[in-house]
């Protein structure tokens, strides 16, 4: 059974992931120059189901495409370069989902824009955090 300290650690990691995803979304939406419009040409794949930490596998598999899109943004709206930002997210995701579990991600039929994709994973983080508190 998870201890209170491991639950607290999971909660902090999820909060960190949530902040990173929100920062990306805010950075995109804050564009004066709507490079966002150009970013909307990129397709992202959404999880069929995202209710448990193991489902973060689906996020991990989309991090490389996410970095590619963020490179379009020329990173001036982000504190970190896209590569560093995605690397940070990847570390948190690996810790949260656990590297020893082999979970095959199932994707929904409908693809999503970067905004829809980020909002989906932000909602996921918020939902899991709420069950831990």
């Amino acid at each position: 059974a998870p201890t209170s300290s491991s639950t607290k650690k999971t909660q902090l990691q999820l909060e960190h992931l949530l902040l990173d995803l929100q920062m990306i979304l805010n950075g995109i939406n804050n564009y004066k120059n709507p490079k966002l419009t150009r970013m909307l040409t990129f397709k992202f794949y959404m999880p069929k189901k995202a209710t448990e930490l193991k489902h973060l596998q689906c996020l991990e598999e989309e991090l490389k495409p996410l970095e590619e899109v963020l490179n379009l943004a020329q990173s001036k709206n982000f504190h970190l370069r896209p590569r560093d930002l995605i690397s940070n997210i990847n570390v948190i995701v690996l810790e949260l989902k656990g590297s020893e579990t082999t979970f095959m991600c199932e994707y929904a039929d409908e693809t999503a824009t970067i905004v829809e994709f980020l909002n989906r994973w932000i909602t996921f983080c918020q939902s899991i955090i709420s069950t831990l508190t």
Partner: antibody, heavy 117, light 107 residues
Amino acid sequence: EVQLVQSGTEVKKAGDSLKISCKGSGYNFDTYWIGWVRQMPGRGLEWMGTIYPADSDTRYSPSFQGQVTMSADKSISTAYLQWGSLRASDTAMYYCARFSSSAYDIWGQGTMVTVSS
Amino acid sequence: SYELTQPPSVSVSPGQTARITCSGDALPRKFAYWYQQKSGQAPVLVIYQDTKRPSGIPERFSGSSSGTTVTLTISDVQAEDDADYYCQSADRSDSYVFGAGTKLTVL
């Protein structure tokens, strides 16, 4: 009503210069990219490039880079496409279009350019 | 340079279903857009982001995507659907490309 109105038909000689226009109305012209599309007689659509009127940031298709110049005057909500020296092969219909949600959702009526040699 | 491949022509009788395909290597990661162009007129957006329909476009028009191919489907084809249809997408360098177009003939 959101619309783009283009300048009229042009008949020119090879070697002439030309500047055609595209005036936007019914929306904030500054904050949408304007694309230019060529359609030669009996042919398909070709993307030439795009300009962002707020700061005149431009992106050209490799096929049209150096062949045409895109500009914009945000004070009068107008985008321009110009040639320094026309060729007979520039004979075509030229469309401007507003880029929104990553698609060209509003199109001008087109400007027909005929270049005789 | 990046290319989108469409069939040159598709013929269908009124009331039937027309399917127009568009193939491109980047389509698994890039959305596609469909435009209708009737003779002597400017193009009109009929489908954006693979499957979404702009307001004012009849429900008969739908889009789907699978791998490197996207499909525009027009069900219950009407005489007024007789037109050229172009798919459009962006390559990985963010340059925009149109397919060569498909002439839909309503018999």
